[in-house]
């Protein structure tokens, strides 16, 4: 009668939790895409705009070839986990301004949680490690002004997309050497 | 050092109007959400409404929604709070404050508001 | 009625520790950041606490915030006739979409 609804499936083939993993990367890329474009559209950006607690991008188009599906996943799955607290972050402190968002960074924070719980569904069916981050997450500080909050919020939906856009590319070149 | 001094306040009819400016120094005051607080004498702290650090964006309290407009000069580091349709429940110390985020880090030191016929 | 809810007075002698609670919602405490305000008589609020449990310089350390789900509270240490005053709590609401405070709780320093 199979399992009980509700209880994760036992999958035999690796790639079609990748082709999940996959998807929902890919439907949070479109998310992102969009928010940033709200946000600029309400808040428009003057220029460049970084956060140094966010983390640095973990693929470019020289590293694409030498990809392995460990490294990939364990630091997707770091990278995603930083993104997560810096959204929650921006919920909870970042100001008024950004309230009138709340719904769409709400539904965001949702999703990447979801997508966390994906990886780590894969990593364990891979038996690959669930490594720690490197090193322990810094706590996120108090804005200095709105205006910052602002920006910072701009670095966020940046820097995600940039690592999500990446991570598509990286899981599906992965999938075909499965 | 951060300066906020109120002005504008003094005794009004009730279903007239008046506006209370806050002059900002010692900041950048284009960087900061500004909020009005009040307080009814012998009460405690009541929220009034926030404007986002270029304007865009304000939230009302219930209370004074549809009467009470904030709005702010960048150019000139103005706070402004237009009331209108007064009644004597609007009688209070009327404080600007300066938020990064959502606390109040700096007020002004607030302009009395009297409401009476 | 305060969205927030905070004990009317609380009371204390010189160098005893007094906790002020503050208790909400999902909406308010719940889901963001709580402040607290030192209010001296006849003088504007004063930020004593943010971000649940951040000091602002210049605040002594006998004042500390803790927060756990949708309840607060402020504990000040060695209590000091200086520390007589109102204090209030304040989050941001996303029910109301703006500040909420507690009524506020005025503090005796005894003897």
């Known amino acids: 009668p199979g399992p009980p609804a509700g209880s994760p499936r036992v999958s035999s083939d690796p790639r079609a939790d990748l082709d999940s993993a996959v998807l929902l990367t890919r439907s949070l890329l479109a998310d992102t895409r969009q928010l940033a474009a709200q946000m600029r559209d309400k808040f428009p950006a003057d220029g460049d705009h970084n956060l140094d607690s966010l983390p640095t991008l973990a693929m470019s188009a020289g590293t694409l070839g030498s990809l392995q599906l460990p490294g990939v996943l364990t630091r997707l799955r770091v990278d995603l986990m930083s993104y997560f607290r810096h959204v929650q972050w921006l919920r909870r402190a970042a100001g008024p301004s950004l309230k009138t968002l709340e719904p769409e960074l709400g539904a965001l924070q949702a999703r990447l949680e979801r997508l966390l719980r994906r990886l780590q569904l894969l990593m364990s069916r891979l038996a690959l490690p669930q490594a720690a981050p490197d090193q322990p997450a810094v706590p996120l500080g108090p804005p200095a002004s709105a205006w910052g909050s602002i920006r910072a919020a701009h670095a966020i939906l940046g820097g995600l997309h940039l690592t999500l856009d990446w991570a598509v590319r990286g899981l599906l070149l992965l999938k075909t050497r499965l | 050092q951060v300066q906020l001094v109120e002005s504008g306040g003094g005794v009004v009819q009730p279903g007239r109007s008046l506006r209370l400016s806050c002059a900002a120094s010692g900041f950048t005051f284009s960087h900061y959400d500004m909020h009005w607080v009040r307080q009814a004498p012998g009460k405690g702290l009541e929220w009034v409404a926030v404007?986002?650090?270029?304007?865009?964006?304000?939230f009302y309290a219930d209370s004074v929604k549809g009467r009470f407009t904030i709005s702010r000069d960048n150019s000139k580091n103005t706070l402004y709070l237009q009331m209108n349709s007064l009644r004597a429940e609007d009688t209070a110390v009327y404080y600007c404050a300066r938020t990064p985020g959502f606390h109040f880090d700096y007020w002004g030191q607030g302009t009395l508001v009297t409401v009476s016929s | 009625q305060s969205v927030l809810t905070q004990p009317p007075s609380a009371s204390g002698t010189p160098g005893q520790r007094v906790t002020i609670s503050c208790s909400g919602s999902?909406?308010?405490?719940?889901?963001?950041?709580v402040n607290w305000y030192q209010q001296l008589p006849g003088t504007a609020p004063k930020l004593l606490i943010y971000?649940?449990?951040l000091r602002p310089s210049g605040v002594p350390d006998r004042f500390s915030g803790s927060k756990s789900g949708t309840s607060a509270s402020l504990a000040i240490s060695g209590l000091r006739s200086e520390d007589e005053a109102d204090y209030y709590c304040s989050a941001w609401d996303d029910s109301l979409s703006g500040v909420v405070f507690g009524g506020g709780t005025k503090l005796t320093v005894l003897g």
């Open positions: 404007i986002s650090y270029e304007g865009s964006v304000k």
């Open positions: 971000y649940d449990d």
């Open positions: 999902s909406s308010n405490i719940g889901s963001n950041y």
